[in-house]
Amino acid sequence: KELKVTQPEKSVSVAAGDSTVLNCTLTSLLPVGPIKWYRGVGQSRLLIYSFTGEHFPRVTNVSDATKRNNMDFSIRISNVTPEDAGTYYCVKFQKGPSEPDTEIQSGGGTEVYVLAKPSHHHHHH
């Protein structure tokens, strides 16, 4: 089956301090290679999560990525801050022959808007 990386939501809004899920599914697990999430594009893009065993604070996988037929690479970002705003891309790589893995396809991106946390005013009578 032809490989396609799908990010169904073009954008999501989340209140500061809350958590949000960024969805990403693949149509094929071949060719082999890791899936990674980035914020931004180009040389300055920031690695947010990699499905290669490392620990990323505040970011977890949503489904059990250890299933050999898993094609759901959605992530949850917890305790969102205003600095987390931006466009997130789910990227599929093909393993490289003794060299860096090659990016072969990216999802369309999901823009995260971070809303100010509503302030709670206590009124004393």
Epitope: L30, D64, A65, K67, R68, K95
Partner: antibody, heavy 118, light 109 residues
Framework: EVQLVESGGGVVQPGGSLRLSCAAS????????MSWVRQAPGKGLEWVAG????????YYPASVKGRFTISRDNSKNTLYLQMNSLRAEDTAVYYC???????????WGQGTLVTVSS | SYELTQPPSVSVSPGQTARITCSGG??????YAWYQQKPGQAPVTLIY???KRPSNIPERFSGSSSGTTVTLTISGVQAEDEADYYC???????????FGGGTKLTVLG
């Protein structure tokens, strides 16, 4: 320090059953897929079963499918291998192994010997 | 029979370089690893993901890949490197973990 300790091996008659256990420590057991690999006397390594971290998905080669069942209890940090309808060719040292993110093996137990003989 | 193919034996003098090859898997669906096993002991992982070395493994062990063949290279071979070496794989197309038949490394002298 990652530790995997197998137990439950022994001598069993052809057609019999045996359950192996693997006690894991030193890592977050519930986050890792696990496998069983065996080695017949004087022979090479053979993968016999794999299981996802959550335990819902299991995998086997044709040589043991329908006879062996892999399972896990994440609350006890323990991996199991239930072996039924055992044959002489199942005689081997059985190792439990932790899987990497791409289903290779990074840590191995010391093994437990299973002998199928009448 | 083993799905992956590696030579049954390799001999090398101390200080020389040993190379063990493994072939048989599809490049697009396979990841490879190398395991060392000494007599009476459990296997030890030397290389995973074709060329990644665990932090506790000496730098003289390295892995590389070219097409459908992967190679374990042991530079400056030492007497303690005498062991059996197994190539192992993960095949994403079948969800299985094939092994090679093993290579016995003999350190001469």
């Amino acid at each position: 320090e990652v530790q995997l300790v197998e137990s439950g091996g022994g001598v069993v008659q052809p057609g019999g059953s045996l359950r192996l256990s693997c006690a894991a420590s030193g890592f977050t057991f519930s986050s890792n897929a696990m496998s069983w690999v065996r080695q017949a006397p004087g022979k090479g390594l053979e993968w016999v079963a794999g299981i996802s971290a959550g335990g819902s998905d299991t995998y086997y080669p044709a040589s043991v499918k329908g006879r062996f069942t892999i399972s896990r209890d994440n609350s006890k940090n323990t991996l199991y291998l239930q072996m039924n309808s055992l044959r002489a060719e199942d005689t081997a040292v059985y190792y439990c192994a932790r899987e990497t993110w791409n289903h290779l093996f990074d840590y191995w137990g010391q093994g437990t010997l299973v002998t199928v003989s009448s | 029979s083993y799905e992956l193919t590696q030579p049954p034996s390799v001999s090398v003098s101390p200080g020389q370089t040993a190379r063990i090859t493994c072939s048989g898997g599809s490049y697009s669906s396979y990841y490879y690893a190398w395991y060392q096993q000494k007599p009476g002991q459990a296997p030890v992982t030397l290389i995973y993901s074709d060329d990644k070395r665990p932090s506790n493994i000496p730098e003289r062990f390295s892995g590389s890949s070219s097409g459908t063949t992967v190679t374990l290279t042991i530079s400056g071979v030492q007497a303690e490197d005498e062991a059996d070496y197994y190539c192992g794989g993960y095949d994403q197309s079948s969800y299985t973990n094939p092994f090679g038949g093993g290579t016995k490394l003999t350190v001469l002298g």
